[in-house]
């Protein structure tokens, strides 16, 4: 080994070197949080870039660049360091017009903390491993969601457009003429029944066990879906989103109530099955795989 390489190895394995890098990263993160940084922070930026460059040079001199098995670029964690440095110089010395997008990559510096803190490295390693192991579970999850989305599509397509419409129209008004002239929320409230505090017209259905309209209103299928049109089973993609919402239990009781009011109480069976399979079983299966991967990584 050449003297330069021996010195580089000594620096690299020294605990103070790790401490210096860690302190630099943390200080850098603090500086990045500044809203309107003063002018002198520019010089601090250069210092940080200098330290990161020095760290990478030490690593390259100690381990080699990319030819051998344990060289600098053979370690994925070093790819991050390399990218951080490349972007630091790119944003500083190369005029690329709108650099604000490139400046975003400065945030990657915070990720350098992972490679320095051993515990964090283990957790992230486990996370990456779990993602690899999750592929089968993910395929199963997407398959199950797709199947139920298709069932939902068949059962509830268009149902969430059912609304309670005012029966006593002016003598020359028709449903179509009204829908063509409605513009504001207030116009809608004149013709459709709204519960107090609700932003959507009252849903209703045509089966005996579905929601009924109050006196003076009749159930029609018209207009858009609830929640600004985002809640529906009208296409496979919307149905899939609704099923994902059920699986993650994201305000799912509202979707459940809306659908049951529009389709009928019998369809609670569909929701029971989806919640049990999707929310209880699949979510826990995903967690189990993550836990297993973490255990493996620890060992």
């Amino acid at each position: 080994f050449s003297p330069l390489r021996r010195i580089s190895i000594k620096i690299l394995v020294h605990s103070l070197f790790s401490m210096l890098i860690m302190c630099t990263i943390l200080t850098n993160c603090i500086f990045m949080t500044m809203n309107n940084p003063p002018d002198w922070t520019k010089n601090v930026e250069y210092t940080f870039t200098g330290i990161y460059t020095f760290e990478s040079l030490v690593k390259i001199l100690a381990r080699g660049f990319c030819v051998g098995e344990f060289t600098f670029l053979r370690d994925p964690w070093n790819w991050l360091d390399f990218v951080v440095i490349v972007f630091a110089y790119l944003t500083e010395f190369v005029n690329l017009g709108n650099v604000s997008a490139l400046r975003t990559f400065r945030v990657l510096r915070a990720l350098k903390t992972i490679s320095v803190i051993p515990g964090l490295k283990t957790i992230v390693g486990a996370l990456i491993q779990s993602v690899k192991k999750l592929s089968d579970v993910m395929i199963l999850t997407v398959f199950c969601l797709s199947v139920f989305a298709l069932i939902g599509l068949q059962l509830f397509m268009g149902n969430l457009k059912h609304k309670c419409f005012r029966n006593s129209l002016e003598n020359n008004e028709t449903l179509e003429s009204i829908m063509n002239t409605l513009e504001s929320e207030e116009d809608f409230r004149k013709y459709f029944y709204y519960l107090e505090g609700s932003k959507d017209a009252l849903l209703c259905g045509f089966s005996t066990d579905s929601g009924q309209c109050p006196e003076g209103y009749t159930c029609v299928k018209i207009g858009r879906n609830p929640d600004y049109g985002y809640t529906s089973f009208d296409t496979f993609s919307w149905a899939f989103l609704a099923l994902f919402r059920l699986m993650t239990q994201d305000y799912w009781e509202n979707l459940y109530q809306q659908t049951l009011r529009a389709a009928g109480k019998t369809y609670m069976i569909f929701f029971v099955v989806v919640i049990f399979l999707g929310s209880f079983y699949l979510i826990n299966l995903i967690l189990a795989v993550v836990a297993m991967a973490y255990e493996e990584q620890n060992q």
């Epitope: 029966n167 129209l169 179509e176 003076g216 009749t218 018209i222």
Partner: nanobody, 124 residues
Framework: EVQLVESGGGLVQAGGSLRLSCAAS????????MRWHRQGAGKQREFVAR???????GYADSVKGRFTISRDNAKNTVYLQMNNLNPEDTAVYYC??????????????????WGRGTLVTVSS
């Protein structure tokens, strides 16, 4: 497809009575309001009477007290009982309904449907 068919029109003496009926057919789920309109020769179509699915009624001023609208929800039919007819009542009477029905492919559609009309002639 939803169809509205009017019947009961014809020739009647002034002061006489007629009963018009309008039957809706098709895969109907719900009928909201049902209305009668009329159009005399060279005149614009005018509203006559209406009835909602909870049997609330409304009439044009010109027919109030003479005409009575009713409906049979089980048969999806609306009736217009016309008493004390006069020559000004001569017109083609049209039935209109707000219908929600199951259409091709099993999807549901709500819309306004019209009948083809039935002619009522009142002679003096």
């Amino acid at each position: 497809e939803v169809q509205l068919v009017e019947s009961g029109g014809g020739l009647v003496q002034a002061g006489g009575s007629l009963r018009l009926s309008c039957a809706a057919s098709g895969r109907i789920l719900r009928i909201g309001y049902m209305r009668w309109h009329r159009q005399g020769a060279g005149k614009q179509r005018e509203f006559v009477a209406r009835i909602t699915d909870d049997s609330a009624t409304g009439y044009a001023d010109s027919v109030k007290g003479r005409f009575t609208i009713s409906r049979d929800n089980a048969k999806n039919t609306v009736y217009l009982q016309m008493n004390n007819l006069n020559p000004e009542d001569t017109a083609v009477y049209y039935c209109e309904a707000l219908v929600t029905a199951s259409v091709r492919g099993g999807s549901i559609h709500s819309g306004t449907y019209w009948g083809r009309g039935t002619l009522v002639t009142v002679s003096s």
